[in-house]
Interface confidence: medium
């Protein structure tokens, strides 16, 4: 366990031309506040996925009124750090979003109004226990300067806050196999205490009180060998009794979502959908009012004047969730017809159409025969965008410009031999077969089985196919 700490140093116009106008004025005094969202790993979807490592909201900064005619200076900031506690190990790599919000304090009906001034996002590597890291990020014409660090909460230490430390039991040394806890040299690394009864051979733990099984073992204490046979169902009745290989507890088993939140499994973890008034990874953050600015991504907060009354976030287009924290994947609705690829541009959807289709949703089938000519008496066939020629006998190719070999498709059945002919092809049938393509067997008594040979043609004679 530990805490991620963020110190905002300044927020103001960035270098270069085009300085932004001050967000506040004499008519509209305002103050700033900040939100930070953290996720483990080098996530590419910084704005969309939930803040799995945690989120924090700053206090409001001092009220600021622009001096007439003056350029926008660095704006007055809230006091103190933004702190995001993390319960589990620090992941080492993380993604962040820092949002700068403006609270307008004019004569709005229904209280103050909030608007998002800037959002910056990034991906960083950071070891817990290290020094403050400084950063500068730009969002449009604005520039944000800040520092951050991750620190472990005692008794945890180490770059991931997974080692535990205890005061030394003897003044001079640590116990057998235990190292001093740098930088706390007067303390010793504490052994992890796994769940009572956890098999020392087949189980291990990364957090106190847990019991995780090595491959081939199962059960709450990792004492049951896995057998892959005789399993009745994917989550069989009892792995402990049958020795069946069953999935470990699903991430939603036992519902980790507090305060009535509903849990859904994700490929690597779980996601809580929180009722109004609650947010956080496990819906554990409560007592939120509109004054806390609970709506992400420019959502408008209504109601919730005190902690006992619920607020509602009215989300802008493209966002959803009780706090507007989820981006709507509008492309998942598969709006593009005929195999078009979907691009969600934020303000609009675009479809990239496959060849032969057009229209906002690729719904129009282009007639590719328009203005096309097929040579040698061929006719153009519209094939959903594919320019196709149906060629006259003896010709082939995309535009019927090539002389075709009528025998290439091996049209003569039952071992008949094919001969190209000026009017098409001729099949010389093997003994016992007849017909234009040698498709009809001849009965031993000489009577053919459908249809009768044309007059003057003996079975086995070449059959011309016109």
């Amino acid at each position: 366990a530990g805490v991620f700490e963020l110190q905002i140093h300044s927020f103001g116009p960035g270098p270069g031309p085009g300085a932004p106008r001050s967000p506040c004025s004499a008519r509209l005094p305002c103050r700033l506040f900040f939100r930070v969202c953290l996720k483990p790993g080098l996530s590419e979807e910084a704005a969309e996925s939930p803040c799995a490592l945690g989120a924090a909201l700053s206090a409001r900064g001092p009220v600021y009124t622009e001096q007439p005619g003056a350029p926008a200076p660095d704006l007055p900031l809230p006091d103190g750090l933004l702190q995001v506690p993390f319960r589990d190990a620090w992941p080492g790599t993380f993604s962040f979003i820092i949002e700068t919000w403006r609270e307008e304090l004019g004569d709005q009906i229904g209280g103050p109004a909030w608007s998002l001034l800037a959002r910056v996002a990034g991906r960083r590597r950071l070891a817990a226990g290290g020094p403050w890291a400084r950063d500068i990020q730009r969002a449009g014409a604005w520039e944000l300067r800040f520092s951050y660090r991750a620190r472990c909460e005692p008794p945890a230490v180490g770059t991931a806050c997974t080692r535990l430390c205890r005061p030394r039991s003897a003044p001079s040394r640590c116990g057998p196999g235990l190292r001093p806890c740098a930088p706390l040299e007067d303390e010793c690394e504490a052994p992890l205490v796994c769940r009572a009864g956890c098999s020392p051979e087949h189980g291990f733990c990364e957090q106190p009180g847990e019991c995780r099984c090595l491959e081939g073992w199962t059960g709450p204490l990792c004492t049951v060998p896995v057998s892959t046979s005789s399993c009745l169902s994917p989550r069989g009745p009892s792995s402990a009794t049958t020795g069946c290989l069953v999935p470990g507890p699903g991430p939603c088993d036992g519902n980790p979502c507090a305060n009535g939140g509903s849990c859904s499994e994700t490929p690597r973890s779980f996601e809580c959908t929180c009722p109004r008034g609650f947010y956080g990874l496990r819906c554990e953050v409560s007592g939120v009012t509109c004054a806390d600015g609970p709506c992400f991504n420019g959502g408008l907060c209504v109601g919730g004047a005190d902690p006992d009354s619920a607020y509602i976030c009215h989300c802008p287009p493209g966002f959803q969730g009780s706090n507007c924290e989820k981006r709507v994947d509008r492309c998942s609705l598969q709006p593009c017809r005929n195999g078009g690829l979907c691009l969600d541009l934020g303000h609009a959807l675009r479809c990239r159409c496959r060849a032969g289709f057009a229209g906002p949703r690729c719904e129009h089938d282009l007639d590719d025969c328009a203005g096309r000519a097929c040579a040698n008496g061929g006719t153009c066939v519209e094939g959903g965008g594919a320019h196709r020629c149906s060629c006259a006998l003896g010709f082939g190719g995309r535009d019927c410009r090539e002389r075709a070999d009528p025998c290439a498709a091996r049209p003569c059945a039952h071992g008949g031999r094919c001969y190209a002919h000026f009017s098409g092809l001729v099949c010389a049938c093997a003994p016992g077969y007849m017909g234009a393509r040698c498709e009809f067997p001849v009965h031993p008594d000489g009577a053919s089985a459908l249809p009768a040979a044309p007059p003057g043609l003996r079975p086995g004679d070449p059959q011309r196919y016109l």
Partner: antibody, heavy 119, light 107 residues
């Protein structure tokens, strides 16, 4: 001659990931989209997704709940399909297939890569 | 998703005879249906697309018909090399979906 040559068979444990490659030759790689399709033993073919190699824009079958990622390396004329959080029901033959650019979706197919998921 | 239902599951036809396979979609897919041939040890082969357009190089004993929800693949004169499993697939909208397959054998 258009050819799609896929990587060899893989055996994986549940929870792991697998990355299958598909090397294209005989045509301009960035001019044709690439599909991935799988077929579990005794089952029908199942479309997984498609990518436009010219800019890596992709569309995925939502059935896979974000477990599938399709990428390309245009310098190597190779498409990749990665499937994460594998389960036993992901045991299948995985195919890449070239999109014909007209309405026929898949005109050339790879030979298939067998992925077995077993503990 | 659009569900594609193929019938029959298997079909035994004499050499030179006609083979007919049906495919039905749960909603209209206009003409956007493809047929594929799958043989062991060979790559899958596109036969027909847009319901009735013959893919280049495919023998003209193969033909496709239908639109909306009901489609048919016909092999006018079955040859030994036509023994295979045949799949229909809608290419009208994502996710593309396939039928369950029809195994064609020689009687």
């Amino acid at each position: 001659e258009v050819q799609l040559v896929q990587s060899g068979a893989e055996v994986k444990k549940p929870g792991a990931s697998v990355k299958v490659s598909c090397k294209a030759s005989g045509y301009t790689f960035t001019s044709y989209w690439m599909h991935w399709v799988r077929q579990a033993p005794g089952q029908r073919l199942e479309w997984m997704g498609v990518i436009d190699p010219s800019d890596s824009l992709a569309n995925y079958n939502q059935e896979f709940k974000g477990r599938v990622t399709i990428t390309v390396d245009t310098s190597a004329s190779t498409a990749y399909m990665e499937l994460s959080s594998l389960r036993s029901e992901d045991t299948a033959v995985y195919y890449c297939a070239r999109d014909s650019t007209v309405v026929a979706p898949m005109d050339y197919w790879g030979q298939g890569t067998t992925v077995t998921v077993s503990s | 998703d659009i569900v594609m239902t193929q019938s029959p599951d298997s079909l035994a036809v004499s050499l030179g005879e006609r083979a007919t396979i049906n495919c039905r979609a749960t909603k209209s897919i206009s003409k956007y249906l493809a047929w594929y041939q799958q043989k062991p040890g060979q790559t899958n082969k596109l036969l027909i697309f847009s319901g009735s357009t013959l893919q280049s190089g495919v023998p003209d004993r193969f033909s496709g018909s239908g639109s909306g929800t009901d489609f048919t693949l016909t092999i006018s004169s079955l040859q030994a090399e036509d023994v295979a499993v045949y799949y229909c697939q809608q290419h009208h909208e994502y996710p593309y979906t396939f039928g369950g397959g029809t195994k064609v054998e020689i009687k």
